[in-house]
Interface confidence: medium
């Protein structure tokens, strides 16, 4: 029951996390900037991974996509790549984990197969979460070091027009969404990996005890009952090695050369 709960909760947490990663990737508010602020009008510029927007206190809003790939900084391209990889891995992980859920029965799927699928999806969620956290952190670092405005000229591909005023950008809402979403996906992945351990079928769920004859000179007649292994008979009338009572962890439960002296 605890395993099912852990697996189910891990799936739900990861699902919320991946939805958050998708939302953060699509959001325009990765970085925000107060361009102009006076009692009459305020103009805000905010930028995402795919486009730049301007919003005025009057209600006017305009967004424009980045015109070129070549003119954009490599760091921005790296952040885009990390977020997309995170989404793809997360989506595959979700698909795998649906079939791995203990509460869902698909044909005659073995518990071991479900355990493997749970582990696979868990690892995918962990990597997905790490990708999102890394992507958001790289972008945040760009803002902190003021690398964004010095390198990412939004007018590239438009005749090289430069911005006349350069002011510092601040963290946008998408960064916080990305961090939280990445963390949730990571936690969900860890929960799936923990659930995998409980799903994996154990070799023996209890300690079976084999009882052996205690006497050193006891010989059994042909066809007699062999107490130590429960297989066959002692046809050669040889003494049975006295090992006393031992658990199945200590002795093999099938006849081998070690059973006889």
């Amino acid at each position: 029951m605890a395993v099912t709960a852990c697996q189910g909760l891990g799936f739900v947490v990861s699902l919320i996390g991946i939805a958050g990663i998708i939302a953060a990737t699509c959001m325009d508010q990765w970085s925000t900037q107060d361009l102009y602020n006076n009692p009459v009008t305020a103009v805000f510029n905010y930028q995402g991974l795919w486009r730049s927007c301007v919003r005025e206190s009057s209600g006017f809003t305009e967004c424009r996509g980045y015109f070129t790939l070549l003119g954009l900084p490599a760091m921005l391209q790296a952040v885009r790549a990390l977020m997309i990889v995170g989404i793809v891995l997360g989506a595959i992980g979700l698909l795998v984990s649906i079939f791995a859920l203990k509460c869902i029965r698909i044909g005659s799927m073995e518990d071991s197969a479900k355990a493997n699928m749970t582990l696979t999806s868990g690892i995918m969620f962990i990597v997905s979460g790490l990708c999102a956290i890394a992507g958001v952190s790289v972008f945040a670092n760009m803002l902190v070091t003021n690398f964004w405005m010095s390198t990412a000229n939004m007018y590239t591909g438009m005749g090289g027009m430069v911005q006349t005023v350069q002011t510092r950008y601040t963290f946008g809402a998408a960064l916080f969404v990305g961090w939280v979403a990445g963390g949730l996906t990571l936690i969900g992945g860890v929960m799936m990996c923990i659930a995998c351990r409980g799903l994996a079928p154990e070799e023996t769920n209890y300690k079976a005890v084999s009882y052996h004859a205690s006497g050193h000179s006891v010989a059994y007649k042909p066809g007699g009952f062999k107490a130590s292994t429960g297989f066959g008979s002692n046809t050669k009338n040889k003494k049975i090695y006295d090992g006393g009572a031992r658990t199945e962890d200590e002795v093999q439960s099938y006849p081998s050369k070690h059973d006889y002296v």
Epitope: L35, Y36, T41, V43, N45, S52, V54, E56, S58, F60, E62, R64, F67, M154, Y155, G157, M158, G159, M161, V162, Q163, T164, V165
Partner: nanobody, 122 residues
């Protein structure tokens, strides 16, 4: 390199109309938003109107809303500012500018014309 040139300014009676033109050279004109700004003697440059690169959205200063209309034709590389019901306080040098956004923020505009004088007499 994009260059912009204003024309159509002049002297007009209060309540009259005037149409300013902004002609741009350069194939990338359609990539830019076009904004109109004005500067009266002894005053700061103020935003008048702007139009997005596609012409799909416009932005006006409260003082000119309902009186001025901005439009553009990307095929002709030209933008216009139709000014109706002119008032003496509209007297200023009118500047056309090309920028990334159709915002009231002058820092957004990288390309500026020399300006054209509009005088409204009472």
């Amino acid at each position: 390199e994009v260059q912009v040139q204003e024309s159509g300014g002049g002297l007009v009676q209060a309540g009259g109309s005037l149409r300013l033109s902004c002609a741009a050279s350069g194939r990338t004109f359609s990539n830019y938003a076009v904004g109109w700004f004005r500067q009266a003697p002894g005053k700061e440059r103020e935003f008048v109107a702007a139009i997005t690169w596609s012409g799909g959205s416009t932005n006006y200063a409260d003082s000119v809303k309902g009186r001025f209309t901005i439009s553009r034709d990307n095929a002709k590389n030209t933008a216009w500012l139709q000014m109706n019901s002119l008032k003496p306080e509209d007297t200023a040098v009118y500047y056309c500018a090309g920028g990334f956004f159709a915002t009231s923020y002058s820092g957004n505009y990288g390309y500026w014309g020399q300006g054209t004088q509009v005088t409204v007499s009472s």
